[in-house]
Structures are given as structure tokens and as C-alpha cells.
């Protein structure tokens, strides 16, 4: 059920920096039995269901909703990061009555921290990962999916937010990082540059790949994503980047070939239900670990990140659909909606394999390799 | 109270055709993917066709394909199936269910609806 | 023949615990798709009984329970209760057929 269209499972190379998207750019649905907040009427969202900030949107949970769209959020904000060699353009502005973090772009003012203060935080996301500076873990176990197959109906909403292209997900599709460290998927969201210009949002050695898609996910426990903003593992999300392959990948074009139908801003549409978890890497075990923050304001820190070692391959038909086909608030390209990379400052990325170890081509000169932190969690 | 109210049946010869419906209330109806299950005399349960909450997209049963239209009335909270050509083997209680649970059960079902297909 | 294969029948004292299996394949049950349960009381619509290969809508005994491995998933009925006895069913999706499958249905009998 996997995608067979992964690239090798060669650690992941590269390095750039870009924009952060925990909550703030993708909504986030609420858990399946848990109360959510509703996003403002007006909005096309079902009932029950409401707008958080952070990593795209992020909405709280609520009850099994009677309705076929049960679980809707709306867009959250996000912030701009600083410094960006690549800086992405002006184009993801969200303004939302009544949100204190609408008024936030990517590339450009208001600063972040003016936005929310969090975006000035310490531990913040994304990150550049450096598979020799990572420390293995060996209790860093494969990933557990379930639930992750849909049925085509009910069908799911995907909605052009502004910042991103947003798929809300439906209750039950469960994740576990761990024992005792379990999850519920909420929505994923997707972040890519523009022609010629790469725009993930992680890079790896100062490498950044095309694109980068987030499954946003709560832990199971708490019921809403606002009581989990800022906690230490309320929330968690699963990166993996998309690169270029020769063949078109049938699990995105699902959702890419409806892309046009979301052109405009604020505008959704109702998609097939599909296997969510053919959108991953095949490979669950090996992947970078560490907490950081969503990569969108309100920029909340104590999100778990895990990062596949193993990408995603599209054609690049698809890549150029999936940068060259939404548009932003006003007349601007839906483009280079990433966060700069940010510093780690002491914080260590684990690693659930030997990373360090004939990994990178780059490995010439002997490195202190950490030592891993976590050490049965 | 959250119900759906079917309506339609009768007898009919082969080759005949029939339309059923499927009145909600109680509940959204426009927000909610809709099937028809028909379960034959002493037999089981066999989903016949489905829609989604818009309308836009349909799906069949091979058994059905060509000959059974399922369509909906959001402004009239209502589900229809158009059955044409109809055979001996469509003889059935027919169910219109929702399929609002988004694990892919159906969580709210009609009385049901005879139809008896003979010369 | 049904997609989804149940026992014809089952049957259990009253206290007792019974179970009736569904077994599917690897284009249904086994791709990852959830089974859910229906009971069908005799000249009535079947009522939707576990959902999400273990969920309970709400108004459904908790004697009432299901799993799922692999190909194959179970309803359980513990301290069976003379109305129980009636007809069960298991339904999921199949991306092979491009449809909602059923079982063939299983009837429980409480001696």
C-alpha cells in the first residue's frame, strides 16, 4: 500500500531553509470524539469545526460529526521567518477576522513574533538536518499507521487556505510514534517553491527539495489542538519531501488534478477519500527526529517532527502543477510558501538508524556523532 | 429524529423500470454521501450504488452498471434511484443508507422498499 | 457468492460468549479498509452495530465488541441475551471492485 515510486532510501541530502507550517498554515481537524471549536460562520466549514493556528490550521477535535465534511478547519496563520537565502515571496497572506494570527505573510511584514511571539522562540522549526551531526536511536522504532486507507465517500475537503493547499482528514487514522506515544491525524498540507526554485521546508546539509508534504497529527491525549499548542508532544507531524522521478505518482495526482478547482483563495472542493498513507514513504523506520515548533504562527514549540529518511517521487508534471497552479490573496502566486530554516540551538536530531555512518557522500572527515537522548521514550 | 422515509416500490415486469426515493430529515442531508443496499428474499445485504454529498460523483455495483441512475434533490432532502431494464434478480427490499460515517459505515438506514420484478 | 466470507450460523447459551468472524482478502479487509457490523432483527433495516472495525455508535451494548487482523476481522457478543438472536453482517470497502462489500450474513442462535 505503500508508494513504490519512493526514492532510494539514501539519507536524505541537501540542505535550505524555508518557512515553518505546524499549525499556523494547514487547518487542523479535531479528533473524532473530542469537541472542537467552529470556524467563524460564513466560512464553508461544517459544523463543530474550528480554526487553530499553527501548522496550517489547525482544528480542534470534536464529536463524530453527522456530516460527510465532519471535520473542518479553517485556515490558520503563518508567519514569516527571517534571513532566508531564498525568500519567499509575498503571497501567503491570510486575513481573518477575529484571528489573532490572520494578519501574518510569508517573506515579508508583519514580522512574525509581532504576529505571534512564539515565531521567536528558541526551538522553532524548520530545521537543517545534518545526517552525520544525528544521534542514532535505536529505540526510535518504525512508525505505526493505522486507519489511514479511506473509502472513496464520504469525501474529504481540500481547500486552497491562502498558504498552502490543505487536505482535512477524517477521525480514526491513528499514528504511533512509539509505545504510549500515539496520535491522531488532523490534516496534511503541502509547502513548494516556484520554476526552477526548490521550496521544502526542511533541508538536509543545506539542500532543499522541491517540495515537502505535512501530515499534522494530535496526541491522543488531548481532545483539542488548542490544549495541546505548546505542550511537549501535543502535537506531531510527519515531513517527508517530494522530489522529481520519471514516473507520475497515482496517489498525488488524486489530489493534484483537482488543484485548478482551488485556484482561488479561500476556495475548496471535495475529493474521493484515498490510501493517505500512499502519500508517505514506504519505509517507516528510518527517519530524523527532534521537537520543534509549527512552521507557521502561531509558531507553538513541543511539536515532535519526524522526518523520513526515504522521499517521495513526483513527475515534473506534477511538481510544476502542484507551484504553478494556486493563487494567494490578490493577484499573487500561491509560491515559495516556507519558512527559513532555524537554528537548533543545542538541540540534537535523532536519528532511528545510523545516519552518520557511510551516509553521505560528504562523510570524509571524521565527526562527533551525539549520542542519543531518548533513551526507551 | 433523524430518519430516512423511502418510497417506490411496487411490482413491475421485467424490462420495466421504477424510481425509488428517499426522503430525509433530522439531519443535514446535503452534507452527506447517500447509498442504496437491496437485500434479496432470504438472502443478504448487497450495496447497489452510491453518491456523494454534491452529487458530482456516483459509483455502481457491476450488477447494475447501465441499467440503475442514483441521483439526489439537496433541496429536497431527497435520494432517488432510477431502476431501468430491470430483471428477475433485482427482486429485493431496497435500503437507502447514508454513508455520513467517514470510516465507510453506513450509520443510518431507510425502512426499506419492496420491489418485486415478474410477469 | 459474498465478497466478504461469514459462518451460515453460530449459536451460544444465554450468559455465554460467541463470536462470528469475517473473512476478506487483501483488495478489502486486508489493504487496510474498516469492517463495521450490522444486526438485522427480522422485517427490520439492519442497524449499524460496530463501526471502525471496533467502535460502538452510541445506544450499543458494550457486550458488543470488534476486532480486526489482517484479512479477517470478528464480532464478539458476550453475555448473550435471547435478543441477540437474529442476523449479523460485516461489511467493508473493496478497491479491487470499486464497492461496498458485504458478508453473506451469519444468524445467531441463543439455545
Known amino acids: 500500500q505503500r508508494l513504490p515510486r519512493m526514492q532510494e532510501d539514501s539519507p536524505l541530502g541537501g540542505g535550505s531553509s524555508g518557512e515553518d507550517d505546524p499549525l499556523g498554515e494547514e487547518d487542523l481537524p479535531s479528533e473524532e470524539d473530542s469537541p472542537r471549536e467552529e470556524d467563524p460562520p460564513g466560512e464553508e466549514d461544517l459544523p463543530g469545526e474550528e480554526d487553530l493556528p499553527g501548522e496550517e490550521d489547525l482544528p480542534e477535535v470534536k464529536p463524530k460529526s453527522e456530516e460527510e465534511g465532519s471535520l473542518k478547519l479553517e485556515d490558520l496563520p503563518t508567519v514569516e521567518a527571517p534571513g532566508d537565502p531564498q525568500e519567499p515571496q509575498n503571497n501567503a497572506h491570510r486575513d481573518k477576522e477575529g484571528d489573532d494570527q490572520s494578519h501574518w505573510r510569508y517573506g515579508g511584514d508583519p514580522p512574525w513574533p509581532r504576529v505571534s511571539p512564539a515565531c521567536a522562540g528558541r526551538f522553532q522549526s524548520p530545521v537543517d538536518i545534518r545526517p552525520q551531526l544525528a544521534a542514532f536511536c535505536p529505540a526510535l522504532r518504525p512508525l505505526e499507521l493505522l486507519g489511514f486507507q479511506l473509502p472513496p465517500l464520504p469525501e474529504l475537503r481540500l481547500r486552497n487556505n491562502g498558504h498552502s493547499v490543505q487536505l482535512t482528514l477524517p477521525p480514526g487514522l491513528e499514528m504511533a510514534l512509539g509505545p504510549g506515544r500515539e496520535y491522531r491525524a488532523l490534516q496534511l498540507h503541502l509547502h513548494w517553491g516556484a520554476a526552477g526554485r526548490p521550496g521544502s521546508e526542511h533541508t538536509v546539509e543545506g539542500h532543499r527539495f522541491p517540495a515537502e508534504i505535512h501530515v499534522v497529527h494530535l496526541s491522543t491525549a488531548f481532545a483539542r489542538v488548542d490544549e495541546a499548542l505548546g505542550r511537549p508532544g501535543g502535537l506531531a507531524v510527519l515531513a517527508a519531501f517530494l522530489e522529481e522521478g520519471p514516473e507520475e505518482n497515482s496517489a498525488y495526482e488524486q489530489l493534484l488534478s483537482r488543484l485548478e478547482e482551488i485556484a482561488e483563495e479561500g476556495s475548496e472542493t471535495q475529493v474521493p477519500g484515498l490510501d493517505i498513507s500512499a502519500l508517505l514513504p514506504s519505509d517507516f523506520s528510518r527517519y530524523f527526529q527532534y521537537e520543534g515548533s509549527l512552521t507557521t504562527p502561531p509558531c507553538a514549540q513541543g511539536v515532535i517532527w519526524t522526518v523520513f529518511n526515504q522521499t517521495v517521487m513526483l513527475s515534473a508534471k506534477q511538481l510544476h502543477t502542484l507551484s504553478d497552479t494556486l493563487w494567494g490573496p490578490g493577484d499573487s502566486r500561491l509560491q515559495l510558501n516556507f519558512r527559513a530554516t532555524q537554528p537548533l540551538n543545542g538541540r540534537v536530531i535523532e536519528a532511528s538508524f545510523p545516519a552518520g555512518v557511510d551516509s553521505s557522500p560528504r562523510a570524509a572527515e571524521p565527526v562527533q556523532l551525539n549520542s542519543c537522548l531518548a533513551a526507551g521514550d | 429524529e433523524v430518519q430516512l422515509v423511502q418510497s417506490g416500490g411496487g411490482v413491475v415486469q421485467p424490462g420495466g423500470s421504477l424510481r425509488l426515493s428517499c426522503a430525509a430529515s433530522g439531519f443535514p442531508f446535503s452534507s452527506y454521501a447517500m447509498s442504496w443496499v437491496r437485500q434479496a428474499p432470504g438472502k443478504g445485504l448487497e450495496w447497489v450504488s452510491a453518491i456523494s454529498a454534491n452529487g458530482g460523483t456516483t459509483y455502481y455495483a457491476d450488477s447494475v452498471k447501465g441499467r440503475f441512475t442514483i441521483s439526489r434533490d439537496n433541496s429536497k432532502n431527497t435520494l432517488y434511484l432510477q431502476m431501468n431494464s430491470l430483471r428477475a434478480e433485482d427482486t429485493a427490499v431496497y435500503y437507502c443508507?447514508?454513508?455520513?460515517?467517514?470510516?465507510?459505515?453506513?450509520?443510518?438506514w431507510g425502512q426499506g422498499t419492496m420491489v418485486t420484478v415478474s410477469s | 457468492q459474498s465478497v466478504l466470507t461469514q459462518p451460515p450460523s453460530v449459536s451460544g447459551a444465554p450468559g455465554q460468549r460467541v463470536t462470528i468472524s469475517c473473512t476478506g482478502s487483501s483488495s478489502n479487509i486486508g489493504a487496510g479498509f474498516d469492517v463495521h457490523w450490522y444486526q438485522q432483527l427480522p422485517g427490520t433495516a439492519p442497524k449499524l452495530l460496530i463501526y471502525g472495525n471496533t467502535n460502538r455508535p452510541s445506544g450499543v451494548p458494550d457486550r458488543f465488541s470488534g476486532s480486526k487482523s489482517g484479512t479477517s476481522a470478528s464480532l464478539a457478543i458476550t453475555g448473550l441475551q435471547a435478543e441477540d438472536e437474529t442476523d449479523y453482517y460485516c461489511q467493508s470497502y473493496d478497491s479491487r471492485l470499486s464497492a461496498w462489500v458485504f458478508g453473506g450474513g451469519t444468524k445467531l442462535t441463543v439455545l
Open positions: 443508507a447514508n454513508n455520513g460515517n467517514y470510516r465507510g459505515a453506513f450509520d443510518i
